[in-house]
Interface confidence: medium
């Protein structure tokens, strides 16, 4: 069974998938469609790297531009370095500016909804 066929079988269970499962899926050539991606738990999507999302979505990564103002894409963008987002070649904006440090202050983030940044 190839990645695409496997994805079809598990698609209906993915809404509640944890980050670890999404990371594993990104290595299996599944080409997750955007409709499914948009239904994933925001907290599961946030830790994914740009490279992992690109692998997870396959051709559908090109559709991220259309969803950049919607959750979970919007929140995921806010967590990525702008440099990394630029590598997607989609013109996504809103990432962490170059030279900033990201502090993983869970409580701060839970209250404000955004990561805590320290300027250069």
């Amino acid at each position: 069974m190839n990645g695409s066929e496997y994805f079809v079988k598990i698609q209906s269970f993915l809404g509640g998938a944890p980050t670890e499962d999404l990371k594993a899926l990104s290595q299996q050539n599944v080409s997750m469609d955007l409709a499914t991606f948009m239904k994933l738990r925001t907290d599961a999507v946030l830790p994914l790297t740009v490279a992992e999302v690109q692998k997870l979505l396959g051709p559908h990564v090109e559709g991220l531009k259309a969803e950049e103002r919607h959750r979970p894409v919007r929140d995921w963008i806010l967590r990525q370095r702008q440099d990394d987002l630029d590598t997607l070649g989609l013109g996504l904006q809103g990432g962490i500016p170059n030279g900033y440090l990201v502090l993983d202050l869970s409580m701060q983030e839970a209250l404000s909804g955004t990561p805590c940044l320290l300027g250069p």
């Epitope: 990645g3 695409s4 079809v8 469609d33 396959g58 051709p59 090109e62 531009k65 070649g89 013109g91």
Partner: antibody, heavy 120, light 107 residues
């Protein structure tokens, strides 16, 4: 208005290489991936590959993987498709087409096509 | 690779009559399908995306339907300007693949 202007027709000998250019205007070149599709005379459409104009990353159809190279010149908003070791079956019209422009998947815009004739 | 099989190969239609083109994918592609029209000597033109949504400027006599593996393009009332070859295309996974095409002619 989105415009894709391709280079002119080429006649090549078997074994040679050809490089077709595609100059884009009317949209942000680095925000949409560029794809190449070919069509042999009287035949259907065949996807060759694409390129991320931001970092030059590409995906290729396995059928062409060792013979095709897709590149970009960001400063000139131009994409290139080079096909090597040409054979008579490569005689075709080659099209460039960006994907997902205007947030809609699919190829909404196409270049005018470049006819490449391979003949001894 | 996902194989897209189009039927029929050609279609001869009386103006004003409906036409229907079928496209079957060799595996589930969700609704990640587009349809194109190609008139003689021209580049393809996009008609439908996401299986059922018309691109702007496409006449409403064109409609698309289907999901999974079976898709249909319908022309409710064929006009003389609709002659050409119609292609389905999946963008669900690499490599992107096209159907073999259906030639529509006017009787």
């Amino acid at each position: 208005e989105v415009q894709l202007v391709q280079s002119g027709a080429e006649v090549k000998k078997p074994g040679a290489s050809v490089k077709v250019s595609c100059k884009a205007s009317g949209y942000t070149f680095t925000s949409y991936w560029m794809h190449w599709v070919r069509q042999a005379p009287g035949q259907g459409l065949e996807w060759m590959g694409n390129v991320n104009p931001s970092n030059g990353g590409s995906n290729y159809n396995e059928k062409f993987k060792n013979r095709v190279t897709i590149t970009v010149d960001k400063s000139a908003s131009t994409a290139y498709m080079e096909l090597s070791s040409l054979r008579s079956e490569d005689t075709a019209v080659y099209y460039c087409a960006p994907h997902y422009i205007g947030s809609r998947p699919g190829f909404a815009y196409w270049g005018q096509g470049t006819l490449v004739t391979v003949s001894s | 690779d996902i194989v897209m099989t189009q039927t029929p190969l050609s279609l001869s239609v009386t103006p004003g009559q409906p036409a229907s083109i079928s496209c079957k994918a060799s595996q589930n592609v969700g609704t990640n399908i587009a349809w194109y029209q190609q008139k003689p000597g021209q580049s393809p033109q996009a008609l439908i995306y996401s299986a059922s949504y018309r691109y702007s400027g496409v006449p409403d006599r064109f409609s698309g339907s289907g999901s999974g593996t079976d898709f249909t393009l319908k022309i409710s009332r064929v006009e003389a300007e609709d002659v050409g070859v119609y292609y389905c295309q999946q963008y669900n996974s690499y490599p992107l693949t096209f159907g073999g095409g259906t030639k529509v002619e006017i009787k």
